[in-house]
């Protein structure tokens, strides 16, 4: 399995209810990535263990997060897999989707890169303690 997580994870709001998540393949020894797994959810849903899962093939390093709801903070993390198995998840990245009147024009929704974000548990199931 890949030894490290995808790097350079960024999440950016590109429409009022749609974000673009992008990333780069894991660092380290040459590893052929066959699939990426993207987990995302609002902070409240994440704490409750109600995440959404997207899969993207190994040549693709972008995905859309759609139907986001203004006023929520969304958490995103990504792992890479190959024929051996799944590697570790990236640090979590948060995106705050602001109400429309504050996200237009020159206002920019808060976006954190993975280097700035809190590190949460790498497991799919997260309990409440891991979010505090």
């Amino acid at each position: 399995a890949p030894a490290g997580p995808p790097v350079g994870v960024k999440v950016t709001l590109i429409e009022d209810d749609t974000a673009l998540v992008s990333w780069k393949p894991p660092d380290g020894p040459e590893t052929v990535v066959t699939r990426y797994t993207i987990l995302y959810a609002s902070r409240k849903a994440w704490i409750a263990g109600e995440w959404q899962v997207l899969h993207r093939e190994g040549a693709i390093t972008m995905a859309l997060l759609e139907n986001l709801v203004a006023g929520n903070v969304y958490i995103v993390k990504i792992s890479a897999s190959n024929e051996v198995g799944e590697g570790p998840f990236s640090n979590s990245v948060e995106l705050a989707v602001l109400p429309k009147e504050t996200s237009e024009s020159n206002q920019r929704p808060k976006r954190l890169d993975s280097a700035d974000a809190k590190v949460y548990s790498g497991y799919y199931h997260l309990d409440q303690k891991s979010m505090t």
Epitope: I14, R35, R56, E57, I60, M62, E104
Partner: nanobody, 123 residues
Amino acid sequence: EVQLVESGGGLVQPGGSLRLSCAASGSAFGSHWMHWVRQAPGKGLEWVSSISSGGSSIYYADSVKGRFTISRDNSKNTLYLQMNSLRAEDTAVYYCARVRRDDDSNYRPFDVWGQGTMVTVSS
């Protein structure tokens, strides 16, 4: 079938300006969000900016914020990107695009129909 034709690219010195245009035909241009994306030589596609159907919501990538301005004229079915204070790292082919809404695991997020317009920033 959507047809998009980008124009306005060229060679410009660092600090210079260009205005890109994207003429659309064959679709209800005024009812869709539109995006500018770019691809630098040897690199992947990078999202640059977006504008809502009526122009009231606008977003920019951090790398261009404060330097680029997106706009549209629905009466002319045309999308624009005013690029100021250009830098060498802005060198790329620029495309106008729409988001592709498809959950296939092999899809890419943007539908790019045009040939793009090359912007080269060099002294």
